[in-house]
């Protein structure tokens, strides 16, 4: 894995990524930026879109590229899977062309793993938003992971993804 | 229609302090950030400071840092430049610029600009 | 700093000619890249984004390309509208930074 200065995790400076799930990050981030400084000022451009509210994924999957998910364990970043992409570009774009602009070649959703398997970790995010949320009352953290079965231990419930992390170390997918 | 207005500018001694100021309309003001970009007589375009559409944010050139702060008033939809310690070569036609751009940043919309000028 | 470095400073053409104005950043920038068009006495204004996504309004003789450190400005006819000065500038990384421009004059 390398050095451990190299794979040090830095808190999340930045106020929008804030309370999204998970508070470490580690740059470059996934469109090369080396400051958290210089993914906020970029970060900031899509305000009107997240004001619109097109997606209701959409400032997750935006912190996921600009200041992805670090963990001391494991030596690279973790993003956003391809199909958050998707979803959100397809909630998304339409509203970008009525501002007058493309959607960004950065956020190309084929760059992204298509999903979370054991080659390509990614974060899939709060789920397909055409689908209701199965609870209709608040979870309290750390009661889903029961539903995994008798691994239950190996998990930690993930507030903003609303599903089951893998805890590192683990052999298995990072989610459920 | 989008619009932004720039005042403020005029005379000033080397030392002396200006503050701009840019009043926005057409667009919802609190969703963008602002930026200044100033052009020296026959010179090019220099960016000067950027803020975010929160307010929370706040980046300069090093030019500028530590003499210059920008700020805004969104129940004004104004922004300002706060210009201290000015020097000469801080001569210049100062532009308000909305930056946008959806993941790079990009002005927009420019003001028509104010000038500053900066002698004995 | 990342510096920009445009070529040439200014060039003399005729209307109906094409025109490459050249942009080049000083460390990758990816596609980080935009142009403006000034008139004298005029605010600039914004014509291509993101190196090569010409922006709303803007005509199609507009066009740009290029990634990492070299980019390109073509007009594909130049129009009496077009003589102007030309800037990129990047928005990789802070400071924003300008190329010094080029001035696009009548032959």
């Known amino acids: 894995f390398g050095d451990e200065e190299e794979r040090r995790c830095d808190p999340i400076r930045i106020s929008m990524c804030q309370n999204l799930g998970y508070n470490v990050t580690k740059m470059p981030n996934l469109v090369g930026h080396e400051l958290q400084t210089d993914a906020e000022l970029q970060l900031t451009t899509f305000t009107p879109l997240i004001q619109y509210g097109c997606s209701s994924q959409l400032q997750f999957f935006l912190c996921s590229v600009y200041v992805p998910m670090c963990t001391e364990k494991i030596n690279i970043p973790i993003g956003p899977c391809g199909g958050m992409c998707l979803s959100v570009k397809r909630r998304c774009e339409p509203v970008l062309k009525e501002f007058g602009f493309a959607w960004p070649e950065s956020l190309n959703c084929s760059k992204f793993p298509p999903q979370n398997d054991h080659n390509h970790m990614c974060m899939e995010g709060p789920g397909d938003e055409e689908v209701p949320l199965p609870h209709k009352t608040p979870i309290q953290p750390g009661e889903e992971c029961h539903s995994v079965g008798t691994n239950s231990d190996q998990y930690i419930w993930v507030k903003r993804s609303l599903n089951c992390v893998l805890k590192c170390g683990y052999d298995a997918g990072l989610y459920s | 229609e989008v619009q932004l207005v720039e005042s403020g500018g005029g005379l000033v001694k080397p030392g002396g302090s200006l503050r701009l100021s840019c009043a926005a309309s057409g667009f919802t003001f609190t969703n963008y950030a602002m930026s200044w970009v100033r052009q020296a007589p026959g010179k090019g375009l220099e960016w000067v400071s950027a803020?975010?559409?929160?307010?929370?944010?706040?980046y300069y050139a090093d030019s500028v840092k530590g003499r210059f702060t920008i700020s805004r008033d969104d129940s004004k939809n104004t922004l300002y430049l706060q210009m201290n310690s000015l020097k000469t070569e801080d001569t210049a036609v100062y532009y308000c610029a909305r930056a946008t751009g959806f993941g790079t940043v990009v002005f927009d919309y420019w003001g028509q600009g104010t000038l500053v000028t900066v002698s004995s | 700093d990342i510096q920009m470095t445009q070529s040439p400073s200014s060039l003399s053409a005729s209307v109906g000619d094409r025109v490459t104005i050249t942009c080049r950043a000083s460390q990758s920038i990816s596609s980080y890249l935009n142009w403006y068009q000034q008139k004298p006495g005029k605010a600039p204004k914004l014509l291509i984004y993101?190196?090569?996504s010409l922006q709303s309004g803007v005509p199609s003789r507009f066009s740009g390309s290029g990634s990492g450190t070299d980019f390109t400005l073509t007009i594909s006819s130049l129009q009496p509208e077009d003589f102007a000065t030309y800037y990129c500038q990047q928005s990789y990384s802070t400071p924003l930074t300008f190329g010094g421009g080029t001035k696009v004059e009548i032959k």
């Open positions: 993101a190196a090569s």
């Open positions: 803020i975010s559409g929160s307010g929370g944010s706040t």
